[in-house]
Interface confidence: medium
């Protein structure tokens, strides 16, 4: 069986002038997947991305994520590329309000 992933891209404040963009793929099967950030249509090198492992999500399917830090204003140059079971898609960084993540002590 093949279950295609649901892909979701989010952005969050990282530091002044920078944002972290995260691409999440969920509810997919089998577990083999390519998920990577591209800049100007080219995959970023491994040392500029952070990956979560491919983990079971409890429903017999899998989930994973990849994140990278980019300069605010360059969002249009970045897309998340996903390849799974012979299908592929690209997903842009959402525009609009930046989600500010705050730590509550």
């Amino acid at each position: 069986r093949t279950v295609p992933p649901m892909v979701n891209v989010t952005r969050s404040e990282a530091s002044e002038g920078n944002i972290t963009v995260t691409c999440r793929a969920s509810s997919f099967y089998p577990r083999n997947i390519i998920l990577t950030w591209r800049q100007d249509g080219v995959s970023l090198s491994h040392d500029t991305q952070q990956w979560g492992g491919v983990l079971p999500d409890g429903n017999g399917t899998y989930q994973t994520w990849v994140a990278t830090r980019i300069c605010r204003g360059e969002e249009q140059r970045f897309t998340c590329y996903m390849e799974h079971s012979g299908n592929h898609s690209t997903h842009p960084v959402p525009s609009g309000k930046v989600l500010v993540l705050q730590s509550h002590w």
Epitope: S15, G17, Q39, D40, G41, V42, S43, T48, C71
Partner: antibody, heavy 121, light 112 residues
């Protein structure tokens, strides 16, 4: 081994057009972003244009924007530069280069031998 | 646009002696991913340019280890520990951080 061979240069009058080609071999062309770089006689290097592997991202230097068009045919392993409304200041050797800045490697690691474009009346 | 400057523009060197070329950018080339997008190229007489250093301090494949790159966000240095006759040519720095990519004016290294 990797080879990039430019062609299509020559003498053209101001306002005229030329189409440069770059034939690539020795590597998987469709995986590489490409750039055109030019060098006026006796001068330094100037980046002209960039195209992503799939052709979906394209950038130009302000000096050529609206006059030059970069394109590629991955089936033919070829890169092109259509140059319209040519000016005397476009006179240069034009180099075709690979662009690998994101591969954990380096940028513009392969260059062609260049093709000379001369714009003169 | 990011402006790149180099000094000196001409550098006569005795074979076996060290050489140093400076490059400056009008804006920091340090990306938020912690890479510094500064490159060094050498164009030997009558040849196409070839890459020497990528991301400020990484030696490109096949380049002799007498070459090294260093720097910070806006100030960069290319060093040759012992100049050889084959090192003659024009050295260019280039920023690859943002469009348009821009080169320095070049430093011509010649043998005394």
């Amino acid at each position: 081994q990797v080879q990039l061979v430019e062609s299509g240069g020559g003498l053209v009058k101001p306002g005229g057009s030329l189409r440069l080609s770059c034939a690539a071999s020795g590597f998987t062309f469709s995986n590489y972003a490409m750039s055109w770089i030019r060098q006026a006689p006796g001068k330094g290097l100037e980046w002209v244009s960039y195209i992503s592997p799939g052709g979906d991202y394209i950038y130009y230097a302000d000096s050529v924007k609206g006059r030059f068009t970069i394109s590629r045919d991955n089936a033919k392993n070829s890169l092109y530069l259509q140059m319209n409304s040519l000016r005397a200041e476009d006179t240069a050797v034009y180099y075709c280069t690979t662009d690998r800045r994101h591969y954990g490697s380096y940028a513009m690691d392969y260059w062609g031998q260049g093709t000379l474009v001369t714009v003169s009346s | 646009d990011i402006v790149m400057t180099q000094s000196p523009l001409s550098l006569p060197v005795t074979p076996g002696e060290p050489a140093s070329i400076s490059c400056r950018s009008s804006k920091s080339l340090l990306h938020s991913n912690l890479n510094t997008y500064l490159y060094w190229f050498l164009q030997k007489p009558g040849q196409s340019p070839q890459i020497l250093i990528y991301r400020m301090s990484n030696l490109a494949s096949g380049v002799p280890d007498r070459f090294s790159g260093s720097g910070s966000g806006t100030a960069f240095t290319l060093k040759i520990s012992r100049v050889e006759a084959e090192d003659v040519g024009v050295y260019y720095c280039m920023q690859h951080l943002e469009y348009p990519f821009t080169f320095g004016p070049g430093t011509k290294l010649e043998i005394k």
